[in-house]
């Protein structure tokens, strides 16, 4: 019972932190303008992995993709890799733990492939728990270097009065969305490997019996069966078919350029 | 079609006050800010403030801070700016106008000239 | 403070000739997260309100004649007109839309010659 809760818990917390994985990859705000100085600002900024964006005082919203590939800095594309990699494993490992699940019965499946699955899927998670968190933790990284760089050269002059001001980026609610969800996705993983060592059968060690038949003297040990503990190799050998994790585009609604009455 | 439309002409002593109306009317008045303006005889533009309709929030110029008050009444469409504690210096045009995209003003009231004179 | 300041204060041109009016900021307008700068140039004929002509620097606001074009990008700005006529006679402002407090310049006027 135990097991089956474990299990069970490890397959929803999982699935919440590779939500808000999926959340965080298509958020817009991994960055935001610093309004330490003003808090109050006409025009805020705001940078996510796919498209940057700016909402005016007004009330509008405009964004722009960063339509390059190789313009962009290779830090960003690791992030993205990082996320995108999270992402599918994590989708795999959700869709191996449900096969796994001690509470669904599929056909004859014994213990032993349900641990191995069980197994196979939390390690999925936890691989997936720790991209996420690498990914937002190297973008974490980059924006505060950045951030000591442009408060070095905030102001640069540029023939006496005119001056440049450098706009500065903090960290943004897409960042704490993904530590937090890939401190999930890895807890949930954790909680998979704990409740496959309880799914696997114990080596059941039965007393030898002697059976003393009339003539000769033989003895039968019906030896102690090793049941797979999921750490061995998959005796069923049974695929696993990816059925493709896709992310529904983002919702986000802004206000109208043309609201006219 | 879009319209501002703003009270008439005011004189008025130093040391009173005077409030400034300002009617939307043809778009939806709670989703747009709405500025006002000043301009002095013979000078240039000078921004006041804004003030959004929905949660009467405002971005005051810190210039006018202690001189104009901002307020919206939502059910006639209507923005007001009181000025108080006037002065010859007060003696100006004052305008409403929407905020548009790029922070643009794209509709404006046809003024409001307050002068002050004793 | 950002200090817009157009050059020239006033400017005489003949029917039918080119225009061109200068703004410089004291600070970059141009936003980050849309690459947009946020300048925009108003006219205005005495007795009337302002009238918004291009906002973002160089879009046309809808019904201004395509012979008003803006142009540049951080802290200096261009506005242009192409083929001057009688009823572009009047004052023309920039302001700045990019943080608060906004800023006009102090203004141009357009004359004919």
């Known amino acids: 019972m135990a097991v089956t809760a474990c299990q069970g818990l490890g397959f929803v917390v999982s699935l919440i932190g590779i939500a808000g994985i999926i959340a965080a990859t298509c958020m817009d705000q991994w960055s935001t303008q610093d309004l330490y100085n003003n808090p109050v600002t006409a025009v805020f900024n705001y940078q996510g992995l796919w498209r940057s964006c700016v909402r005016e005082s007004s009330g509008f919203t405009e964004c722009r993709g960063y339509f390059t590939l190789l313009g962009l800095p290779a830090m960003l594309q690791a992030v993205r890799a990082l996320m995108i990699v999270g992402i599918v494993l994590g989708a795999i490992g959700l869709l191996v733990s449900i096969f796994a699940l001690k509470c669904i019965r599929i056909g004859s499946m014994e213990d032993s492939a349900k641990a191995n699955m069980t197994l196979t899927s939390g390690i999925m998670f936890i691989v997936s728990g720790l991209c996420a968190i690498a990914g937002v933790s190297v973008f974490a990284n980059m924006l505060v270097t950045n951030f000591w760089m442009s408060t070095a050269n905030m102001y640069t002059g540029m023939g006496g009065m005119v001056q440049t001001v450098q706009t500065r980026y903090t960290f943004g609610a897409a960042l704490f969305v993904g530590w937090v969800a890939g401190g999930l996705t890895l807890i949930g993983g954790v909680m998979m490997c704990i409740a496959c060592r309880g799914l696997a059968p114990e080596e059941t060690n039965y007393k030898a019996v002697s059976y003393h038949a009339s003539g000769h003297s033989v003895a039968y040990k019906p030896g102690g069966f090793k049941a797979s503990t999921g750490f061995g190799s998959n005796t069923k050998n049974k695929k696993i078919y990816d059925g493709g994790a896709r992310t529904e585009d983002e919702v986000q609604s802004y206000p109208s350029k043309h609201d006219y009455v | 079609q879009v319209q501002l439309v703003q009270s008439g002409a005011e004189v008025k002593k130093p040391g009173a006050s005077v409030k400034v109306s300002c009617k939307a009317s043809?778009?939806?008045?709670?989703?747009?800010?709405v500025n006002w303006v000043r301009q002095a005889p013979g000078q240039g533009l000078e921004w006041m403030g804004m003030?959004?309709?929905?949660?009467?929030?405002?971005r005051l110029n810190q210039q006018f801070k202690d001189k104009a008050t901002l307020t919206v009444d939502t059910s006639t469409s209507t923005v007001y700016m009181e000025l108080s504690s006037l002065r010859s210096e007060d003696t100006a045009v004052y305008y409403c106008a929407r905020v548009w995209s790029g922070n643009a003003f794209d509709y404006w009231g046809q003024g409001t000239l307050v002068t002050v004179s004793s | 403070d950002i200090v817009m300041t157009q050059s020239p204060d006033s400017l005489a041109v003949s029917l039918g000739e080119r225009a061109t009016i200068n703004c410089l900021s004291s600070?970059?307008?141009?936003?980050?997260?849309?690459?947009?700068?946020?300048l925009t140039w108003y006219q205005q004929k005495p007795g009337q309100p302002p009238k918004l002509l291009i906002y973002w620097a160089s879009t046309r606001d809808s019904g201004v004649p395509d012979r008003f074009t803006g142009s540049g990008s951080g802290v200096d700005f261009t506005l242009t007109i192409s083929s001057v006529q009688a009823e572009d006679v009047a004052v023309y402002y920039c302001?700045?839309?990019?943080?608060?407090?906004?800023?006009f310049g102090q203004g141009t006027k357009l004359e004919i010659k």
């Open positions: 302001q700045n839309g990019f943080s608060f407090p906004f800023t």
């Open positions: 003030v959004h309709p929905s949660g009467s929030e405002t």
């Open positions: 600070q970059s307008l141009l936003a980050s997260g849309n690459q947009r700068n946020y």
């Open positions: 043809g778009y939806s008045f709670t989703n747009y800010w």
